[in-house]
């Protein structure tokens, strides 16, 4: 088994966490993906994609947006307007059933602290060089989401996943499992 190594990421309140989660294209392109937070030893599903996964059709749950790119083998997660209480351990997973999920390596240990200065969302963690192109030709800084699918917050689901390093389930080949990148 491969040991899960947590990666610590520090943000200020109001900033946006962007995560790029790679996955094996041939195996998981049509699978549902989910973003979950560990609460104790039980993961809580915060958002999950539709099935079959639609290319670049955002799924939005509150401040969380999931955008799956099955043509590219990549799931993008955005958590906007981060708050101190968002701090915790997060994972991208291939969501197959509430009791069975393929877990990412390198879970994200998110630490959100009170911002001391600057406007919310503006910092070294902000996305650079991005132009937002609405229906007009005007361009402004910052990403934009087109026609997000808003999902009413449902009662949290849980996946039974052992979070102890080295004891993850369904690891048949490490190249099949997506890895956690954090885009900051």
């Amino acid at each position: 088994t491969t040991e899960l190594t947590e990666e610590k990421y520090e943000y200020k309140e109001g900033q946006t966490l962007e995560v790029k989660c790679d996955y094996a294209l041939e195996k998981y392109a049509n699978s549902r993906k989910a973003w979950q937070k560990m609460e104790g030893k039980m993961p809580k599903i915060l958002a999950k994609t539709e099935r079959p996964s639609e290319n670049s059709h955002p799924v939005q749950v509150g401040r969380i947006t999931l955008e799956d790119y099955p043509d590219h083998g990549l799931l993008q997660v955005r958590m906007t307007n981060l708050q101190v209480e968002d701090s915790g351990l997060y994972q991208c997973v291939i969501y197959q059933h509430p009791k069975e999920s393929h877990v990412l390596f390198n879970p994200i240990c998110l630490v959100v602290t009170k911002g001391s200065s600057g406007t919310p969302g503006s910092s070294e963690n902000s996305t650079q060089n991005v132009y937002r192109t609405p229906s007009t030709t005007a361009k402004a800084l910052g990403p934009r989401y087109t026609s997000p699918r808003t999902v009413t917050q449902a009662p949290p689901e849980s996946t039974v996943v052992v979070s102890t390093p080295g004891s993850e389930i369904n690891l048949t080949n490490v190249t099949d499992i997506i890895r956690v990148p954090v885009f900051n």
Epitope: K20, H72, R132, T133, T175, R179, V182
Partner: antibody, heavy 116, light 107 residues
Framework: EVQLVESGGGLVQPGGSLRLSCAAS????????MSWVRQAPGKGLDWMAS????????YYVDSVKGRFTISRDNAKNSLHLQMNSLRAEDTAVYYC?????????WGQGALVTVSS | EIVMTQSPATLSVSPGERATLSCRAS??????LAWYQQKSGQAPRLLIY???IRATGIPARVSGSGSGTEFTFTISSLQSEDFAVYYC?????????LGGGTKVEIK
């Protein structure tokens, strides 16, 4: 089979302009991020620009920001790179690439030579 | 920007031997790392993404590993078609950046 065919390369004087085009086939163009990557003669690879499917996100490397413009026409399965205020250091083979973060499929490239 | 450094610049290996290439990032890129192969006069080809996931059609003798700032690319038994230049690339942060390349040549 994915095919990306670049056109529009050639010789241009410093300060001049050139528009590269890329004809895409063999995949759902409108579902894919696209990028331009260049390679100066005898040198390594340099990313230039990336564009989301619907054009809502566009990223540039600092060295071409304000001079180069990436655009796409999903109805025609085409990607473009408008290059203005060209400099000698822009001389390179320009590749049209499927993908926005990593580069999954490449065209054969279009040579752009900036010289007086 | 994140600077990617590859080593060695040139690697001389005999056919059938193992080739191990290194890539180091100036700051953590998690596992947002890809490897490409470029043969002389040809366009590059994606081999590995997500640090260890093989792209479509890439043989099992090719593998990648690492996370954070240190990455390794391995060809377990070099074939004639493997002699080429290899590049690593990070896609955690904009701008996307690539290493300077490692040339794998016949010993």
């Amino acid at each position: 089979e994915v095919q990306l065919v670049e056109s529009g390369g050639g010789l241009v004087q410093p300060g001049g302009s050139l528009r590269l085009s890329c004809a895409a086939s063999g995949f759902t163009f409108s579902s894919n991020w696209m990028s331009w990557v260049r390679q100066a003669p005898g040198k390594g690879l340099d990313w230039m620009a990336s564009m989301k499917q619907d054009g809502s996100e566009i990223y540039y490397v600092d060295s071409v920001k304000g001079r180069f413009t990436i655009s796409r026409d999903n109805a025609k399965n085409s990607l473009h790179l408008q290059m203005n205020s060209l400099r000698a250091e822009d001389t390179a083979v320009y590749y049209c690439v499927r993908g926005g973060w990593r580069f999954e499929s490449w065209g054969q490239g279009a040579l752009v030579t900036v010289s007086s | 920007e994140i600077v990617m450094t590859q080593s060695p610049a040139t690697l001389s290996v005999s056919p059938g031997e193992r080739a191990t290439l290194s890539c180091r990032a100036s700051q953590s890129v998690s596992s947002n790392l890809a490897w490409y192969q470029q043969k002389s006069g040809q366009a590059p080809r994606l081999l590995i993404y997500g640090a260890s996931i093989r792209a479509t059609g890439i043989p099992a003798r090719v593998s990648g590993s690492g996370s954070g700032t240190e990455f390794t690319f391995t060809i377990s038994s070099l074939q004639s078609e493997d002699f080429a230049v290899y590049y690593c690339q990070q896609y955690k942060n904009w701008p996307l950046t690539l290493g300077g390349g490692t040339k794998v040549e016949i010993k």
